[in-house]
Amino acid sequence: MDGSGEQLGSGGPTSSEQIMKTGAFLLQGFIQDRAGRMAGETPELTLEQPPQDASTKKLSECLRRIGDELDSNMELQRMIADVDTDSPREVFFRVAADMFADGNFNWGRVVALFYFASKLVLKALCTKVPELIRTIMGWTLDFLRERLLVWIQDQGGWEGLLSYFGTPTWQ
């Protein structure tokens, strides 16, 4: 379900603002963790201090483990390897849209979007374009907001990711 037009009240785990705040924290942590492990450097990304509650920690760990699984997904690796970074914005949104082109949504694909963003960040670090890192995060959150938010609300918020973990494929 793509979408804006969210119809739920404010507050609680399914409010649009809470989903986007949590999404931003999770994306930031995911990118920093992967950049730290793969490139040996942790980019300065802090939008806001992530809440250190047990639920967010659990979600972060869940994302990390799914991300590690995606390292061995050859189809996703091919998709990312084909990315031409000459016009990154257009490419980012094309690849992101392709991930959901059939109109089917699942948590694996949401994490694959974060994974794709982290790979672009690693490329930016390697090519010494650090200012692109914050921009990539912005693109990812914009896509999440415009195309995935209502679906995440329908899953009961980010907590739905925890019950999904164990399904290995992003497809």
């Epitope: 379900m1 793509d2 979408g3 804006s4 037009g5 649009s16 603002e17 986007m20 931003a24 914005r89 257009e90 949104f93 992101a96 849209a97 959901f100 082109a101 059939d102 109109g103 921009t135 995060m137 912005g138 693109w139 990812t140 959150l141 914009d142 896509f143 907001r145 415009e146 195309r147 209502v150």
Partner: antibody, heavy 115, light 107 residues
């Protein structure tokens, strides 16, 4: 209650400029994309420009690219459309709308470009 | 840019009729499609988003569906207040596009 109120329309000569404002209330524009859509007299809806909240990415219709600029001031909870080098074919009612699936619209403001 | 080809451009129907309006996207837009109703002198109103989700407060006689790149708005039983112009719109990302509009008139 969510509300969008446009202002700044009026009569302007070809080549002139106008700045449209879209004051939002009942929600925080920091979390929403904002869009301008216009409708020429007796014609259909034409998307003009969009601004996205997290990357501040902006997009424009080919017909206005290089002449119009969309922006947002989150401290004022207001979106803007700066229109330069106006042409007769820019005459239309201009609406601002919230989100990509445009769930809330303003009442519209009329821009007339004529000598 | 993605084009949205809407048909028919106008139609005449009677109260109680089933009305179908179609939009074809020039390329895949997933289900990032919305439908709007507009009455003269008024701003458009959102009816359907995400191709098939009914917006809050919209009567259930309105429905949307998707088949590939074809999107359909159906009014199951036309009511007097439904005579208006209807537009489809895609927001796949980047440039947004609207269909040309379908005017639903009284037969």
């Amino acid at each position: 209650e969510v509300q969008l109120v446009e202002s700044g329309g009026g009569l302007v000569q070809p080549g002139g400029s106008l700045r449209l404002s879209c004051a939002a209330s009942g929600f925080n524009i920091s979390y929403y994309s904002m869009h301008w859509v216009r409708q020429a007299p007796g014609k259909g809806l034409e998307w003009v420009a969009s601004i996205y909240p997290y990357s501040s990415s902006t997009y424009y219709a080919d017909s206005v690219k290089g002449r119009f600029t969309i922006s947002a001031d989150t401290s004022k909870n207001t979106a803007y459309l700066q229109m330069n080098s106006l042409r007769a074919e820019d005459t239309a009612v201009y609406y601002c709308a919230r989100s990509s699936a445009m769930d809330y619209w303003g009442q519209g403001t009329l821009v007339t470009v004529s000598s | 840019d993605i084009q949205m080809t809407q048909s028919p451009s106008s139609l005449s129907a009677s109260v109680g009729d089933r009305v179908t309006i179609t939009c074809r996207a020039s390329q895949s837009v997933s289900s990032a499609v919305a439908w709007y109703q507009q009455k003269p002198g008024k701003a458009p109103k959102l009816l359907i988003y995400s191709a098939s989700s009914l917006y809050s407060g919209v009567p259930s006689r309105f429905s949307g569906s998707r088949s590939g790149t074809d999107f359909t708005l159906t009014i199951s039983s036309l009511q007097p207040e439904d005579f208006a112009t209807y537009y489809c719109q895609q927001w796949s990302f980047g440039p947004i596009t609207f269909g040309q509009g379908t005017k639903v008139e009284i037969k």
